[in-house]
Protein backbone atom coordinates (compact mmCIF):
# COMPACT_ATOMS: atom_id res chain seq x y z
CA UNK A 1 0.00 0.00 0.00
CA UNK A 2 2.79 2.42 0.94
CA UNK A 3 4.57 1.75 -2.36
CA UNK A 4 1.42 2.50 -4.39
CA UNK A 5 0.88 5.70 -2.41
CA UNK A 6 4.51 6.76 -2.85
CA UNK A 7 4.36 6.04 -6.57
CA UNK A 8 1.03 7.79 -7.01
CA UNK A 9 2.14 10.82 -5.02
CA UNK A 10 5.42 10.96 -6.92
CA UNK A 11 3.49 10.95 -10.19
CA UNK A 12 1.12 13.73 -9.07
CA UNK A 13 3.95 15.89 -7.67
CA UNK A 14 5.94 15.43 -10.90
CA UNK A 15 2.88 16.23 -12.99
CA UNK A 16 2.38 19.52 -11.10
CA UNK A 17 6.10 20.24 -11.39
CA UNK A 18 6.22 19.67 -15.14
CA UNK A 19 3.09 21.78 -15.63
CA UNK A 20 4.91 24.50 -13.68
CA UNK A 21 8.06 24.16 -15.81
CA UNK A 22 5.94 24.52 -18.96
CA UNK A 23 4.17 27.55 -17.46
CA UNK A 24 7.46 29.16 -16.43
CA UNK A 25 8.97 28.60 -19.87
CA UNK A 26 5.99 30.26 -21.54
CA UNK A 27 5.73 33.17 -19.08
CA UNK A 28 6.83 36.65 -20.13
CA UNK A 29 7.92 37.76 -16.67
CA UNK A 30 11.37 36.20 -16.34
CA UNK A 31 12.81 39.61 -15.64
CA UNK A 32 10.86 42.69 -14.62
CA UNK A 33 11.87 46.32 -14.49
CA UNK A 34 13.39 47.31 -11.18
CA UNK A 35 11.27 50.16 -9.82
CA UNK A 36 13.65 51.20 -7.02
CA UNK A 37 14.81 54.32 -8.87
CA UNK A 38 11.44 55.13 -10.43
CA UNK A 39 8.53 53.69 -8.44
CA UNK A 40 6.05 55.92 -10.29
CA UNK A 41 6.94 54.89 -13.82
CA UNK A 42 4.20 55.19 -16.43
CA UNK A 43 5.94 52.53 -18.55
CA UNK A 44 6.75 49.09 -17.16
CA UNK A 45 9.10 46.67 -18.92
CA UNK A 46 9.35 42.91 -18.52
CA UNK A 47 11.01 40.15 -20.50
CA UNK A 48 10.60 36.44 -21.09
CA UNK A 49 12.58 33.77 -22.92
CA UNK A 50 10.69 34.36 -26.16
CA UNK A 51 9.61 38.01 -26.14
CA UNK A 52 9.87 41.31 -24.32
CA UNK A 53 6.88 43.37 -23.27
CA UNK A 54 6.09 46.96 -22.36
CA UNK A 55 3.02 47.74 -20.28
CA UNK A 56 1.95 51.36 -20.39
CA UNK A 57 -0.03 52.87 -17.55
CA UNK A 58 -2.69 53.69 -20.14
CA UNK A 59 -3.44 49.97 -19.93
CA UNK A 60 -1.92 48.91 -23.22
CA UNK A 61 0.66 46.15 -23.41
CA UNK A 62 2.92 45.65 -26.39
CA UNK A 63 5.00 42.50 -26.76
CA UNK A 64 7.69 41.84 -29.34
CA UNK A 65 9.13 38.42 -30.07
CA UNK A 66 12.84 37.81 -30.39
CA UNK A 67 12.78 37.10 -34.11
CA UNK A 68 16.49 36.41 -34.29
CA UNK A 69 18.42 33.37 -33.20
CA UNK A 70 21.99 34.45 -33.89
CA UNK A 71 21.55 37.87 -32.30
CA UNK A 72 20.47 36.53 -28.91
CA UNK A 73 22.88 36.12 -25.98
CA UNK A 74 24.36 32.61 -25.66
CA UNK A 75 23.16 32.44 -22.04
CA UNK A 76 19.55 33.03 -23.10
CA UNK A 77 19.87 30.29 -25.70
CA UNK A 78 21.30 27.99 -23.04
CA UNK A 79 18.39 28.73 -20.68
CA UNK A 80 15.89 28.04 -23.47
CA UNK A 81 17.64 24.74 -24.23
CA UNK A 82 17.67 23.68 -20.56
CA UNK A 83 13.98 24.45 -20.14
CA UNK A 84 13.00 22.63 -23.34
CA UNK A 85 15.11 19.59 -22.41
CA UNK A 86 13.45 19.66 -18.98
CA UNK A 87 9.98 19.74 -20.55
CA UNK A 88 10.74 16.97 -23.06
CA UNK A 89 12.28 14.69 -20.43
CA UNK A 90 9.42 15.43 -18.05
CA UNK A 91 6.81 14.68 -20.70
CA UNK A 92 8.46 11.36 -21.60
CA UNK A 93 8.79 10.60 -17.89
CA UNK A 94 5.06 11.23 -17.40
CA UNK A 95 4.20 8.95 -20.29
CA UNK A 96 6.41 6.17 -18.95
CA UNK A 97 5.17 6.61 -15.38
CA UNK A 98 1.51 6.30 -16.41
CA UNK A 99 2.19 2.74 -17.62
CA UNK A 100 4.32 2.07 -14.55
CA UNK A 101 1.57 2.99 -12.07
CA UNK A 102 0.68 0.05 -9.81
CA UNK A 103 -3.01 0.96 -9.93
CA UNK A 104 -3.09 0.65 -13.71
CA UNK A 105 -3.10 -2.87 -15.17
CA UNK A 106 -1.81 -3.32 -18.69
CA UNK A 107 -2.01 -6.91 -19.96
CA UNK A 108 0.17 -9.24 -17.94
CA UNK A 109 2.94 -6.72 -17.19
CA UNK A 110 5.18 -8.04 -14.45
CA UNK A 111 6.08 -6.08 -11.35
CA UNK A 112 9.73 -6.14 -12.39
CA UNK A 113 8.82 -4.31 -15.64
CA UNK A 114 6.75 -1.80 -13.70
CA UNK A 115 9.64 -1.32 -11.29
CA UNK A 116 12.02 -0.63 -14.16
CA UNK A 117 9.60 1.83 -15.75
CA UNK A 118 9.08 3.55 -12.40
CA UNK A 119 12.84 3.91 -11.98
CA UNK A 120 13.23 5.20 -15.54
CA UNK A 121 10.51 7.82 -15.09
CA UNK A 122 11.93 8.77 -11.69
CA UNK A 123 15.37 9.40 -13.19
CA UNK A 124 13.75 11.38 -16.01
CA UNK A 125 11.87 13.54 -13.50
CA UNK A 126 15.04 14.14 -11.50
CA UNK A 127 16.97 15.22 -14.62
CA UNK A 128 13.98 17.31 -15.78
CA UNK A 129 13.80 19.08 -12.42
CA UNK A 130 17.55 19.68 -12.42
CA UNK A 131 17.37 21.12 -15.95
CA UNK A 132 14.64 23.55 -14.90
CA UNK A 133 16.45 24.58 -11.71
CA UNK A 134 19.69 25.01 -13.68
CA UNK A 135 17.97 27.05 -16.40
CA UNK A 136 16.27 29.37 -13.95
CA UNK A 137 19.46 29.73 -11.89
CA UNK A 138 21.56 30.59 -14.95
CA UNK A 139 19.03 33.27 -15.90
CA UNK A 140 18.94 34.60 -12.32
CA UNK A 141 22.74 34.79 -12.28
CA UNK A 142 22.66 36.66 -15.59
CA UNK A 143 20.17 39.13 -14.10
CA UNK A 144 22.24 39.72 -10.97
CA UNK A 145 25.37 40.34 -13.07
CA UNK A 146 23.57 42.77 -15.39
CA UNK A 147 21.85 44.48 -12.44
CA UNK A 148 25.11 45.40 -10.75
CA UNK A 149 26.72 46.33 -14.05
CA UNK A 150 23.88 48.74 -14.86
CA UNK A 151 23.97 50.09 -11.28
CA UNK A 152 27.66 50.88 -11.72
CA UNK A 153 26.93 52.54 -15.06
CA UNK A 154 24.17 54.62 -13.51
CA UNK A 155 26.49 56.35 -11.09
CA UNK A 156 29.39 56.84 -13.50
CA UNK A 157 29.38 58.95 -16.61
CA UNK A 158 26.37 60.96 -15.52
CA UNK A 159 26.44 64.35 -17.15
CA UNK A 160 25.46 66.05 -13.93
CA UNK A 161 22.86 68.21 -15.63
CA UNK A 162 20.75 65.47 -17.20
CA UNK A 163 19.81 62.13 -15.65
CA UNK A 164 19.98 59.22 -18.08
CA UNK A 165 18.65 56.40 -15.93
CA UNK A 166 19.33 52.97 -17.39
CA UNK A 167 16.54 50.39 -17.16
CA UNK A 168 17.51 47.73 -14.62
CA UNK A 169 15.84 44.36 -14.39
CA UNK A 170 15.16 42.18 -11.37
CA UNK A 171 13.71 38.71 -10.77
CA UNK A 172 10.34 38.08 -12.39
CA UNK A 173 7.56 35.76 -11.29
CA UNK A 174 8.62 33.09 -13.80
CA UNK A 175 11.89 32.51 -11.93
CA UNK A 176 10.06 31.61 -8.73
CA UNK A 177 7.57 29.46 -10.62
CA UNK A 178 10.51 27.71 -12.31
CA UNK A 179 12.41 27.09 -9.08
CA UNK A 180 9.35 25.70 -7.30
CA UNK A 181 8.30 23.62 -10.33
CA UNK A 182 11.81 22.24 -10.78
CA UNK A 183 11.93 21.35 -7.10
CA UNK A 184 8.57 19.59 -7.26
CA UNK A 185 9.62 17.61 -10.33
CA UNK A 186 12.84 16.63 -8.56
CA UNK A 187 10.95 15.55 -5.42
CA UNK A 188 8.47 13.61 -7.56
CA UNK A 189 11.34 11.85 -9.29
CA UNK A 190 12.94 10.87 -5.98
CA UNK A 191 9.58 9.51 -4.79
CA UNK A 192 9.28 7.43 -7.95
CA UNK A 193 12.77 6.01 -7.40
CA UNK A 194 11.85 5.14 -3.79
CA UNK A 195 8.63 3.50 -5.00
CA UNK A 196 10.65 1.47 -7.50
CA UNK A 197 12.54 -0.25 -4.68
CA UNK A 198 9.29 -1.40 -3.13
CA UNK A 199 7.95 -2.62 -6.46
CA UNK A 200 10.96 -4.70 -7.48
CA UNK A 201 10.63 -8.41 -6.51
CA UNK A 202 13.57 -9.44 -4.33
CA UNK A 203 15.90 -12.08 -5.78
CA UNK A 204 16.07 -15.42 -3.94
CA UNK A 205 18.21 -18.55 -4.25
CA UNK A 206 15.13 -20.78 -4.27
CA UNK A 207 12.80 -21.43 -7.14
CA UNK A 208 9.23 -22.57 -6.80
CA UNK A 209 8.57 -26.16 -7.81
CA UNK A 210 5.33 -27.26 -9.39
CA UNK A 211 4.08 -30.74 -8.65
CA UNK A 212 1.75 -32.08 -11.30
CA UNK A 213 -0.68 -34.78 -10.14
CA UNK A 214 -1.37 -37.36 -12.82
CA UNK A 215 -4.62 -36.88 -14.60
CA UNK A 216 -5.00 -33.35 -13.21
CA UNK A 217 -3.76 -30.12 -14.65
CA UNK A 218 -3.61 -28.42 -11.27
CA UNK A 219 -0.47 -26.80 -9.98
CA UNK A 220 0.23 -27.25 -6.29
CA UNK A 221 2.18 -24.54 -4.56
CA UNK A 222 4.12 -25.53 -1.46
CA UNK A 223 3.23 -23.32 1.44
CA UNK A 224 0.16 -22.24 -0.44
CA UNK A 225 -1.84 -21.75 2.71
CA UNK A 226 0.86 -19.68 4.34
CA UNK A 227 0.00 -15.96 4.64
CA UNK A 228 2.26 -14.13 2.22
CA UNK A 229 3.45 -10.53 2.47
CA UNK A 230 3.59 -7.81 -0.11
CA UNK A 231 1.03 -6.11 -2.30
CA UNK A 232 -1.46 -7.98 -4.41
CA UNK A 233 -1.25 -11.12 -2.24
CA UNK A 234 -4.48 -13.00 -1.88
CA UNK A 235 -5.94 -14.12 1.41
CA UNK A 236 -7.14 -17.75 1.61
CA UNK A 237 -10.67 -18.39 0.43
CA UNK A 238 -11.15 -14.73 -0.57
CA UNK A 239 -11.79 -13.95 -4.20
CA UNK A 240 -10.28 -10.57 -5.14
CA UNK A 241 -10.76 -8.94 -8.50
CA UNK A 242 -7.31 -7.75 -9.58
CA UNK A 243 -7.50 -7.66 -13.32
CA UNK A 244 -7.72 -11.44 -13.59
CA UNK A 245 -6.66 -12.54 -10.08
CA UNK A 246 -7.57 -16.08 -9.14
CA UNK A 247 -8.25 -17.89 -5.91
CA UNK A 248 -5.24 -19.27 -4.07
CA UNK A 249 -5.77 -22.80 -5.35
CA UNK A 250 -5.87 -21.64 -8.97
CA UNK A 251 -2.81 -19.38 -8.93
CA UNK A 252 0.12 -20.59 -10.96
CA UNK A 253 3.34 -20.79 -9.06
CA UNK A 254 5.89 -17.99 -9.42
CA UNK A 255 9.16 -17.60 -7.51
CA UNK A 256 8.48 -16.05 -4.15
CA UNK A 257 10.36 -15.62 -0.90
CA UNK A 258 7.82 -17.98 0.73
CA UNK A 259 8.37 -20.83 -1.67
CA UNK A 260 10.31 -23.68 -0.12
CA UNK A 261 10.91 -27.19 -1.31
Amino acid sequence: MAVTACQGLGFVVSLIGIAGIIAATCMDQWSTQDLYNNPVTAVFNYQGLWRSCVRESSGFTECRGYFTLLGLPAMLQAVRALMIVGIVLGAIGLLVSIFALKCIRIGSMEDSAKANMTLTSGIMFIVSGLCAIAGVSVFANMLVTNFWMSTANMYTGMGGMVQTVQTRYTFGAALFVGWVAGGLTLIGGVMMCIACRGLAPEETNYKAVSYHASGHSVAYKPGGFKASTGFGSNTKNKKIYDGGARTEDEVQSYPSKHDYV
Epitope: T41, A42, V54, S58, G59, F60, T164, V165, Q166, T167
Partner: antibody, heavy 118, light 113 residues
Framework: QVHLQQSGAELVRPGSSVKISCKAS????????MNWVRQRPGQGLEWIGQ????????KYSGKFNSKDTLTADKSSNTAYMQLNSLTSEDSAVYFC???????????WGQGTSVTVSS | DIVLTQSPSSLTVTAGEKVTMSCKSS????????????LTWYQQKSGQPPKLLIY???TRESGVPDRFTGSGSGTDFTLTISSVQAEDLAVYYC?????????FGVGTKLELK
Protein backbone atom coordinates in the same frame (compact mmCIF):
# COMPACT_ATOMS: atom_id res chain seq x y z
CA GLN B 1 -17.11 58.50 -32.38
CA VAL B 2 -15.46 59.29 -29.04
CA HIS B 3 -16.94 62.30 -27.31
CA LEU B 4 -16.38 63.83 -23.86
CA GLN B 5 -19.06 66.24 -22.69
CA GLN B 6 -18.26 68.37 -19.65
CA SER B 7 -20.65 70.20 -17.36
CA GLY B 8 -21.23 73.96 -17.61
CA ALA B 9 -19.32 76.87 -16.10
CA GLU B 10 -19.38 77.35 -12.33
CA LEU B 11 -19.18 80.51 -10.23
CA VAL B 12 -18.51 79.65 -6.59
CA ARG B 13 -17.58 81.28 -3.30
CA PRO B 14 -14.15 80.86 -1.68
CA GLY B 15 -14.03 77.95 0.80
CA SER B 16 -16.87 76.09 -0.90
CA SER B 17 -16.76 72.95 -3.05
CA VAL B 18 -17.72 72.17 -6.62
CA LYS B 19 -18.21 68.93 -8.51
CA ILE B 20 -17.70 68.95 -12.24
CA SER B 21 -18.61 66.10 -14.57
CA CYS B 22 -17.38 64.55 -17.80
CA LYS B 23 -19.76 62.25 -19.67
CA ALA B 24 -18.08 59.84 -22.08
CA SER B 25 -19.60 58.25 -25.15
CA UNK B 26 -18.41 56.27 -28.17
CA UNK B 27 -16.03 53.92 -26.35
CA UNK B 28 -15.80 51.43 -23.48
CA UNK B 29 -15.67 53.94 -20.61
CA UNK B 30 -14.58 51.37 -17.98
CA UNK B 31 -11.49 50.31 -19.93
CA UNK B 32 -9.64 53.62 -20.17
CA UNK B 33 -8.10 55.94 -17.62
CA MET B 34 -9.64 59.41 -17.48
CA ASN B 35 -7.29 62.35 -16.88
CA TRP B 36 -8.08 65.74 -15.42
CA VAL B 37 -6.02 68.77 -16.44
CA ARG B 38 -6.12 72.34 -15.15
CA GLN B 39 -5.40 75.50 -17.13
CA ARG B 40 -5.33 78.81 -15.31
CA PRO B 41 -6.10 81.96 -17.34
CA GLY B 42 -3.20 82.68 -19.70
CA GLN B 43 -1.19 79.80 -18.25
CA GLY B 44 -0.08 76.34 -19.35
CA LEU B 45 -1.50 72.89 -18.71
CA GLU B 46 -1.20 71.14 -15.32
CA TRP B 47 -2.00 67.48 -14.79
CA ILE B 48 -4.24 66.93 -11.74
CA GLY B 49 -4.70 63.17 -11.76
CA GLN B 50 -6.46 60.23 -13.36
CA UNK B 51 -9.05 57.60 -12.54
CA UNK B 52 -9.65 54.12 -13.91
CA UNK B 53 -13.46 53.74 -14.00
CA UNK B 54 -13.22 49.95 -14.15
CA UNK B 55 -12.12 49.64 -10.52
CA UNK B 56 -11.99 53.22 -9.21
CA UNK B 57 -8.18 53.24 -8.99
CA UNK B 58 -6.74 56.78 -8.89
CA LYS B 59 -3.39 58.54 -9.35
CA TYR B 60 -2.84 62.14 -8.32
CA SER B 61 -0.22 64.79 -8.85
CA GLY B 62 1.40 65.65 -5.51
CA LYS B 63 0.11 69.24 -5.44
CA PHE B 64 -3.53 68.19 -5.96
CA ASN B 65 -3.60 65.03 -3.83
CA SER B 66 -5.38 66.37 -0.76
CA LYS B 67 -7.54 68.96 -2.48
CA ASP B 68 -9.30 67.11 -5.27
CA THR B 69 -11.31 63.91 -5.38
CA LEU B 70 -11.79 61.91 -8.56
CA THR B 71 -14.70 59.50 -8.90
CA ALA B 72 -16.46 57.68 -11.73
CA ASP B 73 -19.88 56.18 -12.28
CA LYS B 74 -19.78 53.25 -14.70
CA SER B 75 -23.55 53.06 -15.06
CA SER B 76 -23.76 56.59 -16.50
CA ASN B 77 -20.30 56.61 -18.16
CA THR B 78 -19.44 59.74 -16.22
CA ALA B 79 -16.26 60.84 -14.47
CA TYR B 80 -16.37 63.44 -11.72
CA MET B 81 -13.90 65.76 -10.06
CA GLN B 82 -14.74 67.43 -6.79
CA LEU B 83 -12.74 70.53 -5.89
CA ASN B 84 -12.72 71.33 -2.17
CA SER B 85 -11.83 74.40 -0.08
CA LEU B 86 -11.72 76.60 -3.15
CA THR B 87 -9.59 79.73 -3.34
CA SER B 88 -9.06 82.29 -6.11
CA GLU B 89 -6.02 80.22 -7.13
CA ASP B 90 -8.41 77.48 -8.25
CA SER B 91 -10.05 79.69 -10.84
CA ALA B 92 -9.29 77.91 -14.08
CA VAL B 93 -10.60 75.84 -16.96
CA TYR B 94 -10.68 72.13 -16.09
CA PHE B 95 -10.41 69.55 -18.86
CA CYS B 96 -11.07 65.82 -18.84
CA UNK B 97 -9.12 63.73 -21.33
CA UNK B 98 -9.02 60.04 -22.18
CA UNK B 99 -5.70 58.26 -21.61
CA UNK B 100 -4.71 56.18 -24.60
CA UNK B 101 -2.00 54.00 -26.18
CA UNK B 102 1.39 55.72 -25.93
CA UNK B 103 0.35 57.34 -22.63
CA UNK B 104 -1.27 60.18 -24.54
CA UNK B 105 -4.46 62.16 -24.00
CA UNK B 106 -6.15 61.59 -27.32
CA UNK B 107 -9.65 62.98 -26.75
CA TRP B 108 -10.44 66.03 -24.63
CA GLY B 109 -13.62 67.51 -23.19
CA GLN B 110 -14.47 71.09 -24.11
CA GLY B 111 -13.46 72.28 -20.65
CA THR B 112 -15.35 73.55 -17.61
CA SER B 113 -14.63 77.06 -16.39
CA VAL B 114 -14.59 77.44 -12.60
CA THR B 115 -14.47 80.95 -11.20
CA VAL B 116 -13.91 81.42 -7.48
CA SER B 117 -15.06 84.84 -6.40
CA SER B 118 -16.65 86.44 -3.39
CA ASP C 1 9.29 65.09 -11.20
CA ILE C 2 10.31 65.39 -14.83
CA VAL C 3 10.64 69.04 -15.88
CA LEU C 4 10.04 69.92 -19.53
CA THR C 5 11.60 73.16 -20.74
CA GLN C 6 10.17 74.58 -23.95
CA SER C 7 11.88 77.20 -26.06
CA PRO C 8 11.27 79.73 -27.35
CA SER C 9 8.25 80.83 -25.31
CA SER C 10 6.87 82.59 -28.39
CA LEU C 11 7.58 82.67 -32.12
CA THR C 12 6.49 85.29 -34.64
CA VAL C 13 6.49 83.91 -38.16
CA THR C 14 5.22 84.56 -41.66
CA ALA C 15 3.01 82.14 -43.59
CA GLY C 16 4.97 79.52 -45.52
CA GLU C 17 7.98 79.78 -43.22
CA LYS C 18 9.64 76.76 -41.61
CA VAL C 19 9.41 76.69 -37.81
CA THR C 20 11.16 74.62 -35.18
CA MET C 21 10.49 74.57 -31.46
CA SER C 22 12.36 72.71 -28.75
CA CYS C 23 11.43 70.68 -25.68
CA LYS C 24 14.13 69.55 -23.26
CA SER C 25 13.53 67.04 -20.49
CA SER C 26 15.29 66.84 -17.12
CA UNK C 27 15.35 63.04 -17.45
CA UNK C 28 15.39 60.65 -20.35
CA UNK C 29 12.00 59.84 -21.86
CA UNK C 30 13.44 56.92 -23.83
CA UNK C 31 12.13 53.57 -22.67
CA UNK C 32 14.73 50.83 -23.11
CA UNK C 33 12.11 48.07 -23.39
CA UNK C 34 10.67 49.21 -26.72
CA UNK C 35 13.11 51.99 -27.68
CA UNK C 36 10.29 54.53 -27.74
CA UNK C 37 10.41 58.09 -26.44
CA UNK C 38 7.36 58.89 -24.34
CA LEU C 39 7.05 62.52 -25.42
CA THR C 40 3.82 63.91 -26.86
CA TRP C 41 3.09 67.18 -28.65
CA TYR C 42 -0.28 68.98 -28.41
CA GLN C 43 -1.67 71.98 -30.23
CA GLN C 44 -4.07 74.32 -28.44
CA LYS C 45 -5.91 77.02 -30.29
CA SER C 46 -7.49 79.90 -28.41
CA GLY C 47 -10.65 78.92 -26.51
CA GLN C 48 -10.32 75.25 -27.46
CA PRO C 49 -9.08 72.12 -25.70
CA PRO C 50 -5.64 70.78 -26.67
CA LYS C 51 -5.41 68.51 -29.71
CA LEU C 52 -3.05 65.54 -29.99
CA LEU C 53 -0.46 66.07 -32.74
CA ILE C 54 2.48 63.72 -32.24
CA TYR C 55 3.18 60.84 -29.84
CA UNK C 56 6.28 58.71 -29.19
CA UNK C 57 8.24 61.84 -30.16
CA UNK C 58 7.85 61.25 -33.90
CA THR C 59 4.61 59.37 -34.67
CA ARG C 60 2.01 61.62 -36.26
CA GLU C 61 -1.57 61.20 -35.07
CA SER C 62 -4.03 60.27 -37.82
CA GLY C 63 -5.53 63.32 -39.48
CA VAL C 64 -2.58 65.57 -38.62
CA PRO C 65 -1.06 67.26 -41.70
CA ASP C 66 2.35 65.97 -42.72
CA ARG C 67 3.90 69.41 -42.40
CA PHE C 68 4.12 68.63 -38.67
CA THR C 69 7.18 66.54 -37.82
CA GLY C 70 8.48 65.42 -34.45
CA SER C 71 12.06 64.39 -33.84
CA GLY C 72 14.62 63.82 -31.08
CA SER C 73 15.43 61.18 -28.52
CA GLY C 74 16.30 60.85 -24.85
CA THR C 75 16.09 64.36 -23.48
CA ASP C 76 16.09 66.68 -26.53
CA PHE C 77 13.04 66.93 -28.76
CA THR C 78 11.93 69.16 -31.62
CA LEU C 79 8.64 69.94 -33.33
CA THR C 80 9.00 71.22 -36.87
CA ILE C 81 6.32 72.83 -39.05
CA SER C 82 7.69 72.77 -42.58
CA SER C 83 5.44 75.49 -43.97
CA VAL C 84 3.36 77.42 -41.45
CA GLN C 85 -0.29 78.03 -42.33
CA ALA C 86 -2.62 80.58 -40.74
CA GLU C 87 -4.55 77.76 -39.02
CA ASP C 88 -1.36 76.67 -37.24
CA LEU C 89 -1.38 79.70 -34.98
CA ALA C 90 -1.70 78.21 -31.54
CA VAL C 91 0.20 77.27 -28.41
CA TYR C 92 2.20 74.02 -28.64
CA TYR C 93 2.81 71.91 -25.55
CA CYS C 94 5.05 68.91 -25.01
CA UNK C 95 4.08 66.28 -22.42
CA UNK C 96 5.99 63.59 -20.53
CA UNK C 97 4.26 60.21 -20.70
CA UNK C 98 7.15 58.28 -19.19
CA UNK C 99 6.86 58.95 -15.48
CA UNK C 100 4.32 60.15 -12.93
CA UNK C 101 3.32 62.84 -12.37
CA UNK C 102 2.57 63.46 -16.03
CA UNK C 103 4.01 66.89 -16.80
CA PHE C 104 3.65 69.50 -19.54
CA GLY C 105 6.05 72.08 -20.86
CA VAL C 106 5.09 75.75 -20.45
CA GLY C 107 4.26 75.95 -24.15
CA THR C 108 5.48 77.76 -27.26
CA LYS C 109 3.13 80.36 -28.69
CA LEU C 110 3.12 80.65 -32.47
CA GLU C 111 2.03 84.08 -33.81
CA LEU C 112 1.78 85.59 -37.27
CA LYS C 113 3.67 88.75 -38.25
Amino acid sequence: QVHLQQSGAELVRPGSSVKISCKASGYAFSNYWMNWVRQRPGQGLEWIGQIYPGNGDTKYSGKFNSKDTLTADKSSNTAYMQLNSLTSEDSAVYFCARFYYGNVMDYWGQGTSVTVSS
Amino acid sequence: DIVLTQSPSSLTVTAGEKVTMSCKSSQTLLNGGNQKNYLTWYQQKSGQPPKLLIYWASTRESGVPDRFTGSGSGTDFTLTISSVQAEDLAVYYCQNGYSYPLTFGVGTKLELK
